[in-house]
């Protein structure tokens, strides 16, 4: 089963819960045998996916694998939706499966009225 | 190599509840989801559910909403299934099985032994 | 949720002979990354089951190149070019598409 192919990791319907205004790092498990690929993130936007230029990215190397890491500091609630990584290597275009990160904003759901307030209007 | 342990056999009073195991060794289940299957004797299989271990996100069959509850240890390598209510419908052999996603030769996947339960007054 | 149906029921061989099982999900099982997430299983008298197949066609470590796995949509069929003593027990395809995860019924194939 060993391979000098890169692996991506990401699993296949993953999902993170995560809340507005926390952060939080989004990790793409890299697999790769001698050079490390370039690797980057995009967020799907209906069929296709938009690359993520301007964000904070940085490598996390353990010892049987490497992760390629989104930072979202803090997390804003339209970062809300699904999200892939890719990789170059050897002119291959490596695609993940997508994950999907589901942001609960805070601040609008403490605004909102509890049923009790909602039923005395 | 990969295996899964599970106890062999559980022998459980109707209307308590039960807590099987399943014991990963040669992989980290952090990489991989680690899902349930109900085998009822001399029947085919139910897919139960399935967990995310590295954080702790489950999806459940619709039918075993409320009755299963799946659960990980990531640092003992563990993952449980908790039965509730206990019938003799659930008198069944329940299956772990593990399934390791990566990008292109993708999802290998390795099932433990089953543990036979009996429920029974 | 998506119903599996599988046939024949029980499939009576002769050790060298061909055998074919077929599997028809009740929607299409391709999914929106383009993929088909139909595996087949073997259950062996006793043993826990065994992927042999998966993504419709992709033989696991292992299988021997007498298994084929085709279909597209919602029509899948498992293809035995030479049966052998060890193929005898319960065969389930098995669909990861859809929420959630379903099976078939399964096909007993016994030797004759």
């Known amino acids: 089963k060993e391979s000098c192919d890169v692996q991506l990791y990401i699993k296949r319907q993953s999902e993170h819960s995560i809340l507005a205004g926390d952060p939080f790092e989004l990790e793409c498990p890299v697999k790769y045998c001698a050079n490390r690929p370039h690797v980057t993130w995009c967020k799907l936007n209906g069929t296709t996916c938009v690359k993520l230029e301007d964000r904070q990215t940085s490598w996390k190397e353990e010892k049987n694998i490497s992760f390629f890491i989104l930072h979202f500091e803090p997390v804003l609630p339209n970062d809300n939706g699904s999200y892939r990584c890719s990789a170059n290597f050897q002119s291959n275009l490596i695609e993940s499966h997508s994950t999907t990160l589901y942001v609960t904003d805070v601040k609008s759901a403490s605004e909102r009225p509890s049923k009790d307030e909602m039923a005395s209007r | 190599e990969v295996q899964l342990q599970q106890s062999v056999a559980e022998l459980v009073r109707p209307g308590a509840s039960v807590k099987l195991s399943c014991t990963a060794s040669?992989?980290?289940?952090?990489?991989?989801?680690m899902y349930w299957v109900k085998q009822r004797p001399e029947q085919g299989l139910e897919w139960i559910g399935r967990?995310?271990?590295?954080?702790?996100?489950?999806k459940y069959a619709p039918k075993f909403q409320g009755k299963a509850t799946i659960t990980a240890d990531t640092s003992s390598n563990t993952a449980y299934l908790q039965l509730s209510s206990l019938t003799s419908e659930d008198t069944a052999i329940y299956y772990c099985?593990?399934?390791?996603?990566?990008?292109?030769?993708?999802?290998?996947?390795?099932w433990g032994q089953g543990t036979t339960l009996t429920v029974s007054s | 949720d998506v119903v599996m149906t599988q046939t024949p029921l029980t499939l009576s061989v002769t050790i060298g002979q061909p055998a074919s099982i077929s599997c028809k999900s009740s929607q299409s099982l391709l999914d929106s990354d383009g993929k088909t997430y139909l595996n087949w299983l073997l259950q062996r008298p006793g043993q826990s089951p065994k992927r042999l197949i998966y993504?419709?066609?992709k033989l696991d470590s292992g299988v021997p190149d007498r298994f084929t796995g085709s279909g597209s949509g919602t029509d899948f069929t498992l293809k035995i070019s030479r049966v052998e003593a060890e193929d005898l027990g319960v065969y389930y395809c098995?669909?990861?598409?859809?929420?959630?995860?379903?099976f078939g019924g399964g096909t007993k194939l016994e030797i004759k």
């Open positions: 040669g992989f980290n289940i952090k990489n991989t989801y």
């Open positions: 098995w669909q990861g598409t859809h929420f959630p995860q379903t």
């Open positions: 993504l419709v066609s």
């Open positions: 967990i995310d271990p590295a954080n702790g996100n489950t």
């Open positions: 099985a593990l399934l390791y996603y990566g990008s292109s030769y993708d999802y290998f996947d390795y």
